[in-house]
Every structure is written in C-alpha cells, then in structure tokens.
C-alpha cells in the first residue's frame, strides 16, 4: 500500500538573499490527515536529508540548512504526500536550487532633499539568518546594478527610468515640485538573476528645498 | 550641428502599433538626451517620452501607461518609438527632439529643454 496516494503535482523554490522557502502544490482531495514529508539532496553529497516528516502547510523554510547556497554547487528538494501508513512517490524540483535561483532584492531605499536634488541612498539586504561574513555586497561582490523608477505625483509624467552602477543616486529635480515616489530593482549585470522591485518610498519636494545661486 | 528627420507616421486603426523613427544626419547623438513630442489639433505640444544616449534613463509621459517603448541604435544613430495599444486620442503630429546633456533631470520633461527639434510626421489612429 505504499503508493496509493497521488504525489504532488509540484514542487519549487521561492528564494531571496538568505530567505530560501520550498513550495509545493497540495495533492488532489487530500484529507485532514495529509502531510507532507521534505528532504533535500546538496549536490557532490549525493544522498537525501529528511528534514521534516510531517509538514502540513504547502511551503517549508530552507534557509536554516541551506546556508552554504551561495558557496555550494546548490540543492534540489523533494516532496511526497504522507496520510497515516500510505505515502506517495516523491516529487522532485525540476531545476538545481543554486545562487542563480535567488531573486534579488534590496532592504530599503532612503531618500533626501538637498538643493533641488533627490539624494537616494539604497540600504542593501541584512537577513539576520546569513552568516556574518556572508554580506551580500561579498557574495556579489562585482557588477551591482539597480534599476530606479521616480513617478511623480501630481505631475505630466508617469515615470524616469534610470539603472545605477552604485548604491547612491541623485536626481536633478529642475524646479519641479510635488510627491515623488521611487522604486529600485537590482540586478547583477554578470549573472542571470531576478529583481524584485523595492516597495515604494516617497518624498515631498516644495519651493523650500531650492536655493537661489548666483 | 544635429538634423533630426522623423519617419513612420501613418493611419492605424485604433489598437494597432507604428513604430516612429527619428533619423539624425548630422553629428553623432552621443551626448545627448533625445526624445518624442506630440502636438495634437488645437491641443499645447506634450512630452511622450525620452532617453539619454548612453541608454541607462528613459523617461515617459503620464499617458504612455506601457503602451510606448523608446530605443535607439547607436550604429545607425537613430532614434525609434514603437507605439502599441494606439488610442483615437494618440492622433496628433510626433516630433523628434535632442537636447545637450545626459544628466538624470526632469528638465527633459520640458519642451523648453530641447535645442534640435525635426519637422514632424503624422499619426492617425481611427476607431
């Protein structure tokens, strides 16, 4: 009776810097009574890890055993349906989990007023689970790009678009006056990595802020 | 000395695309901020949308919505529009316009920030 029950239909990882979550898709008609049992293979050490027999949500967090992803030739993760003595066949992630996989993020945006200028100053991310020395400007060390939108609210624009090479940006606001909202996407320009765009962060901008030079 | 010279202009039924190029024979756009303008029948001239010549700032009017995409090919010094999603309210004359500088500055939303401007090409979306 050991493979009655359906297996998952999916199974894939959901990752930012040091905050690497496992997902699946629940089986078909489960009970009250089905969980769902994880384990995890680390490539060159090729034999799978339980790591929890009995999960009943649909997500598992991996980062706690996964630390040395950004150091490692990466994971996979398989899933299988437990309901009392039945269990299914194991689902497996399609892909290698490896750094290639984390989506980029930044941990916020700070913005400042100074003489008609917007100074922004992007705070990179600190997950309190990462190593000391794992930082993510050492783990990506070259190659740091962000792409910044500013939408200005009320205004005759939507949006300026501009990519970044550094942590800091200044925008010429030109006499313009209003809300501006900002947004930054990061990126690194050698790896294949996805961004996330930050949430929204926004400043005020009135006559107060220019000064008048000679 | 830049001469902008806009081609691409057309009819189009409303929800089809056109893309605009903006063809520059004199000097090279290399350091320049270059950019679309649209004035419709009756209506002021309006930003559409601009980019700095090294490519790393775009900027788009509050209308464009996604529908607008603004490129260049360095190669060709050319500037193109690609015009998606078209509204009876995008009908109007599209111009082509260069302006000094790639700073990161809305002054480039300001028709007054232009120096280069070509003569123009129609575009007509009908529902």
């Known amino acids: 009776h050991g493979t009655e029950l359906p297996s998952p239909p999916s199974v894939w990882f959901e990752a930012e810097f040091f905050h690497h979550i496992l997902h699946w898709t629940p089986i078909p008609n489960q009970s009250e009574s089905t969980c769902y049992e994880v384990a995890l293979l680390r490539y060159g050490i090729e034999s799978w890890n339980s790591i929890s027999n009995c999960s009943q949500t649909l997500s598992y967090d991996l980062t706690a055993v996964t630390l040395d992803l950004y150091h490692s030739n990466g994971y996979r993760a398989r899933v299988r349906a437990v309901d009392g003595s039945r269990h299914s066949n194991w689902t497996v992630t399609n892909t290698r989990f490896s750094v290639d996989e984390v989506t980029l993020t930044v941990g916020s945006v700070n913005l400042e007023i100074h003489n008609g200028f917007i100074l922004g100053k992007i705070q990179l991310p600190r997950p309190k689970m990462a190593p000391a020395n794992d930082t993510y400007e050492s783990i990506f060390s070259h190659f740091r790009e962000y792409e910044i939108a500013i939408r200005k609210v009320p205004g005759n624009f939507t949006f300026t678009h501009k990519k970044v090479k550094h942590e800091n940006f200044s925008l010429l606001t030109s006499g313009e006056v209003g809300e501006f909202c900002v947004q930054v996407k990061p990126s690194v320009a050698s790896r294949s990595n996805k961004g996330m765009w930050s949430k929204e962060e926004c400043i005020s901008l009135t006559r107060q802020y220019f000064t008048v030079t000679n | 000395e830049l001469q902008l010279v806009e081609s691409g202009g057309g009819l189009v039924q409303a929800g089809g695309s056109l893309r605009l190029s903006c063809a520059n024979s004199?000097?090279?756009?290399?350091?320049?901020?270059v950019g679309w303008f649209r004035q419709a029948p009756g209506k002021e001239r309006e930003f559409v949308a601009a980019?700095?010549?090294?490519?790393?700032?775009?900027y788009f009017g509050d209308f464009v919505e996604g529908r607008f995409s603004i490129s260049r090919d360095s190669a060709k010094n050319t500037l193109y529009l690609e015009m998606n999603k078209l509204k009876p309210e995008d009908t109007a004359v599209y111009y082509c316009?260069?302006?000094?500088?790639?700073?990161?500055?809305?002054?480039?939303?300001?028709?007054?920030?232009?120096?280069?401007w070509g003569k123009g090409t129609p575009v007509t979306v009908s529902s």
């Open positions: 316009a260069a302006a000094t500088g790639q700073v990161w500055s809305l002054q480039y939303l300001r028709e007054s920030s232009y120096a280069y």
């Open positions: 980019i700095t010549w090294n490519g790393d700032t775009t």
């Open positions: 004199g000097r090279t756009f290399s350091s320049h901020t």
